[in-house]
């Protein structure tokens, strides 16, 4: 950089680069100002005048410092199986996520392609593995001494209460019934709820113009096939 602070536009030193929040304009052959998030380049710089920025119009955005001629369009309204967790603003795209009780059954680079309802374990079965943002609940039969009497995507098998005198023995789908007035629980406390999974963020990525080639994109996938769960049901 020159010894004194250079004001845009300026010609970079031979072999030098432009500063942060500046870009090299090939036509003007000058370092020029980028526009801040929420704005775009209305007029590109010349040798004598800097970039002129303007605010993004409604339903458009820029998330990064940029020199795009037009702001990016916000994504479509969320599908009815999704909820909007981030509104479209001038600085951020709309974010859609699978609604509560659902998970992303098919992820794509653009976000969640298909949301599916979380499996519910029927009575006699409890949650072995809770649902995540990209995987379904896995149910397992309640082991001897435990039960689940609910149809739920969060309830695990709970231990039968221990009776001084048993009126009705417990089974996989029903707690023991005691004649005693003060039954006790074996080990674990009563109802245990697993937390609902955090929904997948479905966000459209914003391309940014650059003098060099853009880096490759990548996205996360769920790990490995999971076996189908027994004892599952729907609503």
């Amino acid at each position: 950089l020159p010894a004194q602070v250079a004001f845009t536009p300026y010609a970079p030193e031979p072999g030098g680069t432009c500063r942060l929040r500046e870009y090299y304009d090939q036509t003007a052959q000058m370092c020029c100002s980028k526009c801040p998030p929420g704005q775009h380049a209305k007029v590109f710089c010349t040798k004598t005048s800097d970039t002129v920025c303007d605010s993004c119009e409604d339903s458009t955005y820029t998330q990064l410092w940029n020199w795009v001629p037009e702001c990016l369009s916000c994504g479509s309204r969320c599908s009815s199986d999704q909820v909007e967790t981030q509104a479209c603003t001038r600085e951020q795209n709309r974010i859609c996520t699978c609604r509560p009780g659902w998970y992303c059954a098919l992820s794509k680079q653009e976000g969640c392609r298909l949301c599916a309802q979380l499996r519910k374990c029927r009575p006699g079965f409890g949650v072995a593995r809770p649902g995540t943002e990209t995987s379904d609940v896995v149910c397992k039969p309640c082991a001897p001494g435990t039960f689940s009497n609910t149809t739920s995507s969060t309830d695990i098998c709970r231990p039968h209460q221990i009776c001084h005198v048993v009126a009705i023995p417990g089974n996989a789908s029903m707690d023991a019934v005691c004649t005693s007035t003060s039954p006790t629980r074996s080990m674990a406390p009563g109802a245990v709820h697993l937390p609902q999974p955090v929904s997948t963020r479905s966000q459209h990525t914003q391309p940014t113009p650059a003098p060099s080639t853009a880096p490759g994109t990548s996205f996360l996938l769920p790990v490995g096939p999971s076996p189908p769960a027994e004892g599952s049901t729907g609503d």
Epitope: R77, S79, D81, Y103, K108, Q109, A116, T134, H204, P225
Partner: antibody, heavy 124, light 112 residues
Framework: QVQLVQSGAEVRKPGASVKVSCKAS????????VTWVRQAPGQGLEWMGW????????HYAQNLQDRVTMTTDTSTSTAYMELRSLRSDDTAVYYC?????????????????WGQGTTVTVSS | DIVMTQTPLSSPVTLGQPASISCRSS???????????LSWLQQRPGQPPRLLIY???NRFSGVPDRFSGSGAGTDFTLKISRVEAEDVGVYYC?????????FGPGTKVDIK
Amino acid sequence: QVQLVQSGAEVRKPGASVKVSCKASGYTFTSYSVTWVRQAPGQGLEWMGWINAFSGNTHYAQNLQDRVTMTTDTSTSTAYMELRSLRSDDTAVYYCAREEGSGSYEDYYGMDVWGQGTTVTVSS
Amino acid sequence: DIVMTQTPLSSPVTLGQPASISCRSSQSLVHSDGNTYLSWLQQRPGQPPRLLIYKISNRFSGVPDRFSGSGAGTDFTLKISRVEAEDVGVYYCMQTTQFPFTFGPGTKVDIK
């Protein structure tokens, strides 16, 4: 070429179960999903459910989800659909079809490849 | 669930004449990714269904250009510019925008 080959016709008594197979070839099985569709005699198409061949994630039609299980065997590139507690109104031709999956980066085509169909007859 | 309806349910046509099938969905089929996952399938007698059109208007490979799709949101149309004998069969619209996937009841196209 890309194809789905289904198992042969089945006859079952009410209350029994049936398991239909759908063997894929000509493409990377785990890059796609498999959808199952059935068609009762003289009727339209009914969507039964879907399985992501990569993750094993499934989603079933609500009226069938207590009786149906869809699975895949990635080692043999085969999808399976098991239907339990069969009733006479389950008599139909059952089709598997390829659908987009986690690894299908090209343009979305929809159900672009279909099996030849498996006739399941439920009769006492 | 998204309900798909089709009109007409039966369409007797003259060879060489155009045919048009309408499909309507009970709610918008525009996905949050911007795509509209509306397909048209053809099922000839005794055969499995065959994909004709995907994402409203894209002809699948090998499908003759006499087939075209149009529409947006909740209203869609399949047109056959000049019906040929091999076009006899039942035509279904279907949505794969969200679960559960749903089909229209089908439109039977036959020759007068």
